[in-house]
C-alpha cells in the first residue's frame, strides 16, 4: 500500500533566506529507521538537497556541512533549509523511506513551493 | 554520463556459486539505492535484490533469500551479488539498476547472463 | 505483494496507429510509484514514465501515462517503427518491488 507524505504547499523563506516546513508520513508500519530526503525540482530536472537517515526516537542529524537541520517527532519531520537565495526558488520535495523492518515503504510528497526574496541593500546612508 | 556495467556471469553447475559485479560511474554511487533484476530466457523481469544508501538494508525476493547476497563498496562505486546454491531456475540475464530520485530504476546495466546446467 | 496484470498480452498494430496499454493492480498503488519500461530485443529495460505519467529525460511525448488507484494506462499516441518491443509496468512504492508480465507491442 502506498505510504501518503503530507507538506505544505508553499513557503516564504525569510529575509535571511531559511525556510522551514513539516513533513508528516503516514506510516503503514512501525518503522524504526527512517531515511528522509529533500529534493528539488526544476525545469523536470530533480537534484538532492539533503538527506538524513535516523532511528525512532533519535534526532535527526544531517550531515555538518548541510543546509538542513530538522527535527523528528513520531511521524513528522519539521525541516529548516539555510542559506537560501533567489535563484533556489522552486518546488522541495519531501520524500521519506521506511528503511526498516521490513517491507520498505517509498513515500514522495506534492512538493513545497518555496520562494526566496534576496533582501535589498542597504543604502549608504550620509550620516 | 551515467553507466553501470555488469560482469562476473557465466555457465556454472547447480549447487556451485557465482559473484557478479556492476561497476557504477558518471554519479554519486553512494546517493543511490540499487537493485538486481533478472529475466530468464523469453520471460518477464522479475525484482530479485535491493540494497541501502550504506548497504545496511538488504531485501530480497523470496525465491532467492538465504542463498543470494547483495552487498557493495561505496569506495569502489561497485555493486555485488554473491550467488550460492545455484539452480536450473536461477538462469537468467541479471541486471544492476539505479534507484532514481523519486523510485523508478531510471538507468540499468547492459546485463550479464548467467546459466545454470549441468 | 502487489500483484501487477498488464494487457493485452500481444498488441498487433501498425505505424502510426494509437496503441493502448492497460496495467491492473492486486491492490491500491499511489500514482506517485507506478512506473512503465520499454524494453527491445537483446536491450536493456529503458524507462519511459514514473508517478504513471511523467515522462523519464529524452522521451518524446508520444508517450503518456495515466490512471491511479489500480488502473492505469501507457498510451503510444502514434505508433513509430522503433516503439515495436515490450512494455511493462512497475510499483515501486513497497517491498517487494513487482513488474507485470510485459505487452508485446508488435508490427501488424
Known amino acids: 500500500k502506498a505510504m501518503h507524505v503530507a507538506q505544505p504547499a508553499v513557503v516564504l523563506a525569510s529575509s535571511r533566506g531559511i525556510a522551514s516546513f513539516v513533513c508528516e508520513y503516514a506510516s503503514p508500519g512501525k518503522a524504526t529507521e527512517v531515511r528522509v530526503t529533500v529534493l528539488r525540482q526544476a525545469d523536470s530536472q530533480v537534484t538532492e538537497v539533503c538527506a538524513a537517515t535516523y532511528m525512532m526516537g533519535n534526532e535527526l542529524t544531517f550531515l555538518d556541512d548541510s543546509i538542513c537541520t530538522g527535527t523528528s517527532s513520531g511521524n513528522q519531520v519539521n525541516l529548516t533549509i539555510q542559506g537560501l537565495r533567489a535563484m533556489d526558488t522552486g518546488l522541495y520535495i519531501c520524500k521519506v523511506e521506511l528503511m526498516y523492518p521490513p517491507p520498505y515503504y517509498l513515500g514522495i510528497g506534492n512538493g513545497t513551493q518555496i520562494y526566496v526574496i534576496d533582501p535589498e541593500p542597504c543604502p549608504d546612508s550620509d550620516f | 554520463q551515467v553507466q553501470l556495467v555488469e560482469s562476473g556471469g557465466g555457465v556454472v553447475q547447480p549447487g556451485r556459486s557465482l559473484r557478479l559485479s556492476c561497476a557504477a560511474s558518471g554519479f554519486t554511487f553512494s546517493s543511490y539505492t540499487m537493485h538486481w533484476v533478472r529475466q530468464a530466457p523469453g520471460k518477464g523481469l522479475e525484482w530479485v535484490t535491493f540494497i541501502s544508501y550504506d548497504g545496511n538494508n538488504k531485501y530480497y525476493c523470496d525465491s532467492v533469500k538465504g542463498r543470494f547476497t547483495i552487498s557493495r563498496d561505496n569506495s569502489k562505486n561497485t555493486l555485488y551479488l554473491q550467488m550460492n546454491s545455484l539452480r536450473a531456475e536461477d538462469t537468467a540475464i541479471y541486471y544492476c539498476?539505479?534507484?532514481?530520485?523519486?523510485?523508478?530504476?531510471?538507468?540499468w546495466g547492459q546485463g550479464t547472463l548467467v546459466t545454470v546446467s549441468s | 505483494e502487489i500483484v501487477l496484470t498488464q494487457s493485452p498480452g500481444t498488441l498487433s498494430l501498425s505505424p502510426g496507429e494509437r496503441a493502448t496499454l492497460s496495467c491492473r493492480a492486486s491492490?491500491?498503488?499511489?500514482?506517485?510509484?507506478l512506473a512503465w519500461y520499454q524494453q527491445k530485443p537483446g536491450q536493456a529495460p529503458r524507462l519511459l514514465i514514473y508517478?504513471?505519467?511523467s515522462r523519464a529525460t529524452g522521451i518524446p511525448d508520444r508517450f503518456s501515462g495515466s490512471g491511479s488507484g489500480t488502473d492505469f494506462t501507457l498510451t503510444i499516441s502514434r505508433l513509430e517503427p522503433e516503439d515495436f518491443a515490450v512494455y511493462y509496468c512497475?510499483?515501486?512504492?513497497?517491498?517487494?518491488?513487482?513488474f507485470g508480465q510485459g505487452t508485446k507491442v508488435e508490427i501488424k
Open positions: 512497475q510499483q515501486y512504492g513497497s517491498s517487494p518491488w513487482t
Open positions: 491492490q491500491s498503488v499511489g500514482s506517485s510509484y
Open positions: 539498476a539505479r534507484t532514481g530520485w523519486l523510485g523508478p530504476f531510471d538507468y
Open positions: 508517478g504513471a505519467f
